[in-house]
């Protein structure tokens, strides 16, 4: 399981209309459920239940975003509408270029994502936990535009990281 180097750029607008960018780095793991590829796009937080909706119109998600899903404790969702892998698949079907799962509260999901699939997704499925997950969710929960860049080798230039 290779390390996924995730670079998140946050766009902070000022009243004058200018914006400042803040870049932060974190690491996750590429799961066997998806491809070990670089990917990028705007971060879109998705609730696990939001991926249950199979309404055709809802499936017309735009192309080119990175889905972030915080998985809940299994006890809170004893009969999920989809497996974790199914949720990743649904996000990619809706146009995600990559999916990042925060597995901090559901570490069992790691095994589910790493079970050798005969038909892995063609897009990366990454999981994060611990301090990296906290860092990611802190960014996602801000009312700010954010983009993620996922790479399977460290970014070439040392990025100036800002504590989010």
């Amino acid at each position: 399981k290779e390390t996924a180097f995730v670079e998140v750029v946050l766009f902070e607008s000022s009243p004058s209309g200018d914006y400042t960018t803040y870049t932060t780095g974190l690491t996750g793991r590429f799961s066997r459920a998806g491809a070990t590829l670089s990917a990028e796009g705007e971060i879109v937080q998705m609730h696990p239940l939001g991926l249950c909706n199979n309404n055709d119109e809802e499936d017309l998600y735009e192309y080119g975003w990175v889905g972030v899903v915080k998985l809940e404790q299994p006890e809170l969702d004893p009969k999920p509408c989809l497996t974790v892998l199914g949720k990743a698949k649904r996000a990619v079907q809706r146009g995600a270029t990559a999916v990042i799962f925060d597995v901090s509260e559901n570490p069992e999901a790691i095994d589910q994502l790493n079970q050798g699939s005969e038909d892995p997704l063609k897009r990366p499925v990454v999981y994060v936990k611990g301090a990296d997950a906290i860092k990611l969710m802190n960014i996602v929960n801000k009312q700010k535009v954010a983009r993620a860049r996922i790479q399977h080798r460290p970014p070439r230039q040392p990025t100036e990281y800002f504590d989010m």
């Epitope: 705007e42 879109v44 017309l60 080119g64 975003w65 996602v140 535009v145 860049r149 996922i150």
Partner: antibody, heavy 117, light 110 residues
Amino acid sequence: EVQLVESGGGLVQPGKSLRLSCSASGFTFSNYGLHWIRQAPGKGLDWLGYSSSNSGTVYGDAVKGRVTISRDNAKNTLYLQLNSLKSEDTAIYYCARGYSSSPFAYWGQGTLVTVSS
Amino acid sequence: DIVLTQSPALAVSLGQRVTISCKASQNVDGFGIGYMHWYQQKPGQKPKLLIFAGSNLASGIPARFSGSGSGTDFTLTIDPVETDDIATYYCQQNKDFPLTFGSGSRLEIT
């Protein structure tokens, strides 16, 4: 069916402010990013700004400092507030759906704003 | 800002092949994602997405339209051209803020 309907256009005097609305239906509004784009008569397309699904905003250069984009997820509506209007702001104003890293997949029909004394 | 340069007007005969170019002032490729898109706008109508991410045909668009290119050079091809294609064609990038459009290429039939 995805629908975006802009309203609030019309004749406005220079120096005044205006607020345009974009009413959305046919999709879960709070899940999507939305943009404002304008087109002056006989001219090209000009991106004004973006509101992300979590209400983050980024603005374009054309109206920087005079514009505020906001959204009301409960009302399925996106807003554009434009201050200190000039004659150069005369244009058709469109809202369009798409994340900042996605194409503009759906467009409203536009609302015409004419700035003139 | 990323500037997109398009040729302003093109004249073509019906049934012919036409290519419309768009040159970006900076690389607009991303990791596993294309940041260049094409739109068609007919007189008095709203723009319509034709091609997304450089080469993907948008839903409901005829296969006469195709897109290609990478980096800074992109092309929209219509083959064969039909009367219904009389319109202005815009390229657009969203690699970086501010998002920008080309100035448009007007297609005329000779």
